[in-house]
């Protein structure tokens, strides 16, 4: 057993119907010593007495709050986790995995050290998030993340719809053109109900970049149906760009065609490579869509940004 | 070419090499995260390889100040690899064919290195090490991790010439 | 598209030779080595050899050295691959396949195949 | 050469079974293994390589494994179209080397 936080402990339980259970010792945070009982909020009436009570843990009704009293007042609580094991490994419950095997999928738009993770749930109820730099090694990476919060969007997965959390995170002494030697590390405390998991990521902002689409999409007609497409860079991306450059794919999109966001990366059928910031295409009807990436390392793509192909004369 | 002393290299050239390095790194080894590299016994060939760091002067300020403190850094980056890539980590098993990507990688390398090598000026290089695994489970581990590596080494070199060549050519 | 076309089926007397083709087309033909292999009737595959056309050099197995010759014509973009002394054993469908392009030889694109019988 | 002993060399199964075929390489491959499904009359068509990574288009249920000496191919939950041949091959020593088959039907 080990704590998690003031009067809350987790207690490791080996989750094979054959197990004995772990033996745990509580102490009523008093210094009185006669006359003390025992409540938990999971069983009826008093569970016993004395200053130290001996439980053992072996399923959820032997966790939650246990609260020693004397005479009608109470003294301390103590709240127990449960962390399951089973066949040596660690439950994973609480979060619904992505579709590449993660739980956490982290995304920073930019190379100055700021990022956003988020993660998926299966139910949305009694929930408590915590995530930090794992790694304590001197020369580890510090990060310092915000609060989670609740998403507006939800996350369909295999025909059900999932909840999603997010957490802004900024790395604390960042060096943006620098080439990364430690990945970030990461660790997400989650609770729900009396139930407790970990779960870590480990990753180089280089490969969590996902730039902004680019903005300002717009028209110039020329001979024929050709006309002149250009865009900017979108305003989250390092500066300056003569350093931190991009490079997009330019796709024409026929009417009532989705586009469709890849996890295998950015050159799609029918997209071509533009360097600039203009070009010229061949559009009647449907959209003209750009989506940008880093022009020297193959991180994920914007999303797209797409204009339709008439023109306003 | 570049000349001797502190003036310029050919940044506009060394930028069309960058890159063009970039694209043949990822064409040799394109699967990011295709096994956690991080994961395996850390070898000291990839401890060993330098690296692109904070106070080496490849930011966009500390180029203008000096350029030549974060070239000598690229070119010995450049030699180390090039040096790993004509080893038997890449020569031995699991065999590469000979379009493979690697080639012009080790070729393009040693061109870009020679692009900053001012004439009868030499600056000092690393050792190689040269350790040579036996397995080809080992080869390839390190292979991947060395690639790995190396397409974050010349992203940052790319945008260093292609900064230079932006702000820096006369 | 990435697209390998073979000659037609062939049928041949032991002692001969026969040159079965390979033309290329969709990708530039010297980047790419391109490898033949061979299934003989409900056997699995085999691995005959390969030519690098941008430099012209084949590579043989071993256990086909001196039966299999492994040429190139950049000028047509095919490949061509020519059995000789045939035997009865070497009636099989030929295909020339191209790798991956990370240089590793895990094969995506196939040729339709050539069935080549040797029968007296 | 390398040999990859590949079994069974044929299996009958129903749909929505879990199909398992396995490959031995007579030496360290590494992970240098790929897998290929030839329907009858067709030329191979690539589905793994590097032992665990699925080629492009191919669907979700058909999965690799394995390092060094040991592979597997594994079709979660088989479909009517999956009858075919399957072979499995590795391109890590020259000469490159494939498994002799196994001949998948449906029950």
């Known amino acids: 057993m080990w704590e998690l936080e003031k009067d809350v402990y987790v207690v490791e339980v080996d989750w094979t119907p054959d197990a004995p259970g772990e033996t745990v010792n509580l102490t009523c945070d008093t210094p009185e010593e006669d006359d003390i009982t025992w409540t938990s909020d999971q069983r009826h009436g008093v569970i016993g007495s004395g200053k130290t009570l001996t439980i053992t843990v072996k399923e959820f009704l032997d966790a939650g709050q246990y609260t020693c009293h004397k005479g009608g007042e109470t003294l301390s609580h103590s709240h127990l986790l449960l962390h399951k094991k089973e066949n040596g490994i660690w439950s994973t419950e609480i979060l619904k995995n992505f579709k590449n095997k993660t739980f956490l999928k982290c995304e920073a738009p930019n190379y100055s050290g700021r990022f956003t993770c988020s993660w998926l749930v299966q139910r949305n109820m009694d929930l408590k998030f915590n995530i930090k730099s794992s790694s304590s090694s001197p020369d580890s990476r510090a990060v310092t993340c915000g609060m989670a919060s609740l998403s507006a969007e939800k996350v369909t997965l295999d025909q059900r719809d999932y909840e999603k959390y997010s957490v802004s995170c900024q790395e604390d002494v960042t060096c943006p053109t620098a080439e990364e030697t430690l990945p970030i590390e990461l660790a997400l405390e989650a609770r729900q109900q009396n139930k407790y998991e970990n779960y870590s990521t480990s990753f180089f902002i280089r490969d969590i970049i996902k730039p902004d689409p680019p903005k300002n999409l717009q028209m110039k007609p020329l001979k024929n149906s050709q006309v002149e497409v250009s865009w900017e860079y979108p305003d989250s991306w390092s500066t300056p760009h003569s350093y931190f450059s991009l490079k997009f794919f330019v796709r024409i999109q026929r009417k009532k065609e989705k586009m469709k966001e890849t996890e295998e990366g950015c050159n799609q059928k029918g997209a071509f490579l533009v360097e600039k910031t203009s070009t010229e295409v061949q559009c009647k009807g449907g959209n003209v869509c750009v989506q940008a990436q880093d022009r020297y390392y193959n991180s994920s793509c914007s999303k797209w940004a797409c204009v339709p192909c008439r023109v306003r004369s | 070419r570049a000349v001797p002393g502190g003036s310029s290299p050919a940044w506009a050239q060394c930028q069309q090499l960058s890159q063009k390095l970039c694209t043949l790194a990822w064409s040799a080894h394109p699967l990011v995260g295709h096994m956690d590299l991080r994961e395996e016994g850390d070898e000291e060939t990839t401890n060993d390889v330098p690296h692109i760091q904070c106070g080496d002067g490849c930011d966009p300020q500390g180029l203008r100040d000096n350029s030549q403190f974060c070239l000598q850094r690229i070119r010995q980056g450049l030699i180390f690899y090039e040096k790993l890539l004509g080893s038997d980590i890449f020569t031995g098993e699991p065999s590469l064919l000979p379009d493979s990507p690697v080639g012009q990688l080790h070729a393009s390398l040693l061109g870009l290195s020679q692009l900053l090598q001012p004439e009868g000026h030499h600056w000092e290089t690393q050792q190689i090490p040269s350790p040579s695994p036996s397995q080809p489970w080992q080869r390839l581990l390190l292979r991947f991790k060395i690639l790995r590596s190396l397409q974050a080494f010349v992203a940052v070199a790319a945008r260093v010439f292609a900064h230079g060549a932006a702000t820096l050519s006369p | 598209q990435v697209q390998l076309v073979q000659s037609g089926a062939e049928v041949k007397k032991p002692g001969s030779s026969v040159k079965v083709s390979c033309k290329a087309s969709?990708?530039?033909?010297?980047?790419?080595?391109i490898h033949w292999m061979r299934q003989a009737p409900g056997q699995g595959l085999e691995w005959i050899g390969y030519i690098y056309p941008r430099d012209d050099s084949p590579k043989y197995n071993e256990n086909f050295k001196g039966k299999v010759t492994i040429t190139a014509d950049k000028s047509t973009s095919t490949a061509y691959m020519e059995l000789s002394s045939l035997r009865s054993e070497d009636t099989a469908v030929y295909y020339c396949?191209?790798?991956?392009?990370?240089?590793?030889?895990?094969?995506?694109?196939w040729g339709q195949g050539t069935l080549v019988t040797v029968s007296s | 050469d390398i040999q990859m002993t590949q079994s069974p060399s044929s299996l009958s199964a129903s749909v929505g079974d879990r199909v398992t075929i396995t490959c031995k390489a007579s030496r360290d491959v590494a992970i240098a293994v790929a897998w290929y499904q030839q329907k009858p009359g067709k030329v191979p068509k690539l589905l793994i390589y590097w032992a665990s990574t699925r080629h492009t288009g191919v669907p979700s249920r058909f999965s690799g494994s394995g390092s060094r000496t040991d592979f597997t191919l594994t079709i979660s939950s088989l479909q009517p179209e999956d009858v075919a041949d399957y072979f499995c091959h590795q391109y890590s020593s020259y000469p490159f080397t494939f498994g002799s088959g196994t001949k998948l039907e449906i029950k």
């Open positions: 396949a191209i790798p991956d392009r990370s240089g590793y030889a895990w094969f995506i694109y």
């Open positions: 969709g990708y530039t033909f010297t980047d790419q080595t």
